[in-house]
């Protein structure tokens, strides 16, 4: 339930992350990809009713009513039609919230990799951030929790899990001998490799940090042609939003 | 209040089959891996079986492997230990734990059901 | 697998006495290391978790230590109450694994 040998980020230093509450509780994490679209991962909403669910943006400590968070409701939700809810295969869905995030220095968005781009190779420098507990027993972080990972050579991680992976699964390794990695309300938060989201936080084992059984993402890359359709079909929209700038080929 | 009840243990012949289960209440399963630990009389604890509900990813021990199966009921907040071709060294009482994830510690335990295997 | 290795595997104390039980695990754990009580006829109970850190509700008398292969419970007073076996565990790696126990009897 939370980032394991991370650190705090100074505050609002990664205005894309989003928080998902369901019963004023964090449940899980995510990524503003545009002004009104958020990217978390399918499994977060499970057995969930989306009218209780929130979306807090612009947040650094989330106990805090700080005056730069934005709270929207979820107005649809988009699984991806191949999720499986035992494997975590294709375990990606895109939020469409209730009003558009008014973007500054503490909400910000986060670029998925290109249409054409390739996962991150094995040794890559990443982080992964989330607000999920920095404690066994339910204490909440001071306020946004990262730390840094390495990307795992696929073979390597899909023999630790036994050959359970898919290859649009990603994963991570400690670049040292320190555990580092997420744990489960960090879900949905996004795995940040040269600025760009490459990954969503996905599973881990019987608990998190285990060498055996190392991190497994969601490989965005593998996802940018549907998350750009869902966006397309739901926002028919003239132009990019205010501050945001539209990547070649890509609909707004 | 956090609360773990296993049930199912009995007396049993050797190459037979049980099921047991760890009904738990006062939390839910997506924030805890569960896992079954036993201990046979006068001896110390072992570690047997575990599951992440949230993935149903499991692992045994390898004294175990490949006769006990171990499975969990989200909706129901109840996990199970499907046990056969027991044998005479599986008689033991067992317990099951939530194991919180982030530091892999068991913080709540079940009373425990004996097994008892024997002819 | 890691394997833990406790000592002594029993004990005699008095009332007040200051107790050290040992844990050493067969390779480097880091700090993942618990401590867990257990009286006969009931389920074990977390005391220590991240071989340092002392469960909610457990008494102040009761401290962990040590990172690494090498880690110490310390009773600094012992209480008529605390007459049980103590395990340690470990919980770097699957599977996670336990001593073989040490029984604290009243001298």
């Known amino acids: 339930a939370q980032i394991i040998g991370g650190h705090e980020v100074t505050p609002h230093s990664r205005p894309y992350m989003a928080s998902v509450r369901f019963g004023g509780q964090h449940h899980c994490g995510g990524f503003l990809l545009r002004a009104r679209w958020v990217v978390s991962a399918a499994h977060c909403f499970s057995h969930r009713d989306l009218r209780t669910g929130l979306v807090v943006l612009g947040a650094h400590v989330l106990s805090t009513a700080e005056p730069t968070q934005q709270v929207f409701g979820i107005d649809a939700l988009t699984t991806h039609p191949d999720y499986h809810p035992m494997t975590h295969a294709n375990d990606i869905c895109l939020l469409r919230l209730n009003g558009s995030a008014v973007l500054g220095p503490a909400v910000g968005l986060l670029r998925p990799p290109g249409r054409r781009a390739r996962p991150p190779t094995a040794g890559t420098r990443c982080r992964v951030a989330g607000w999920g507990f920095v404690s066994d027993f339910e204490e909440l972080p001071p306020g946004l929790m990262e730390a840094k990972v390495r990307v795992l050579d696929p073979d390597v991680c899909n023999s630790s899990w036994k050959g359970h992976l898919t290859l649009t699964m990603l994963c991570t390794r400690s670049g040292d001998s320190h555990r580092r990695g997420f744990c489960s309300a960090d879900s949905g938060g996004p795995l940040v490799c040269r600025n760009r989201a490459h990954g969503l936080v996905s599973f881990s084992g019987l608990w998190c940090g285990d060498p055996k059984t190392p991190d497994v993402y969601t490989q965005v890359s593998a996802f940018v042609a549907w998350i750009w359709d869902v966006v397309r079909r739901s926002s028919p929209q003239p132009g990019p939003l205010p501050g945001t700038t539209r990547p070649p080929g890509e609909a707004a | 209040e956090v609360q773990l009840v296993e049930s199912g243990g009995g007396l049993v012949q050797p190459g037979g089959s049980l099921r047991l289960s760890c009904a738990a209440s006062?939390?839910?399963?997506?924030?805890?891996?569960i896992h079954w630990v036993r201990q046979a009389p006068g001896k110390g604890l072992e570690w047997v079986a575990g599951?992440?509900?949230?993935?149903?990813?499991?692992d045994y021990a390898d004294s175990v492997k490949g006769r006990f199966t171990i499975s969990a009921d989200t909706s129901k907040n109840t996990a199970y230990l499907q046990m056969n071709s027991l044998r005479a060294e599986d008689t033991a009482v067992y317990y099951c734990?939530?194991?919180?994830?982030?530091?892999?510690?068991?913080?709540?335990w079940g009373q425990g059901t004996l097994v008892t295997v024997s002819s | 697998d890691i394997q833990m290795t406790q000592s002594p595997s029993s004990l005699s104390a008095s009332v007040g006495d200051r107790v050290t039980i040992t844990c050493r695990a067969s390779?480097?754990?880091?700090?993942?290391v618990a401590w867990y009580q257990q009286k006969p006829g009931k389920a074990p109970k977390l005391l220590i978790y991240?071989?340092?850190f002392l469960y909610s509700g457990v008494p102040s008398r009761f401290s962990g230590s040590g990172s690494g292969t090498d880690f110490t419970l310390t009773i600094s007073s012992l209480q008529p109450e605390d007459f049980a076996t103590y395990y340690c565990?470990?919980?770097?790696?699957?599977?996670?694994?336990f001593g073989q126990g040490t029984k604290v009897e009243i001298k």
């Open positions: 006062g939390f839910t399963f997506s924030g805890y891996s």
């Open positions: 565990q470990q919980s770097y790696t699957t599977p996670p694994t």
């Open positions: 390779q480097d754990v880091s700090t993942a």
């Open positions: 599951i992440s509900p949230t993935n149903g990813y499991t």
């Open positions: 734990a939530r194991l919180v994830f982030y530091r892999g510690v068991m913080d709540y």
């Open positions: 991240s071989a340092s």
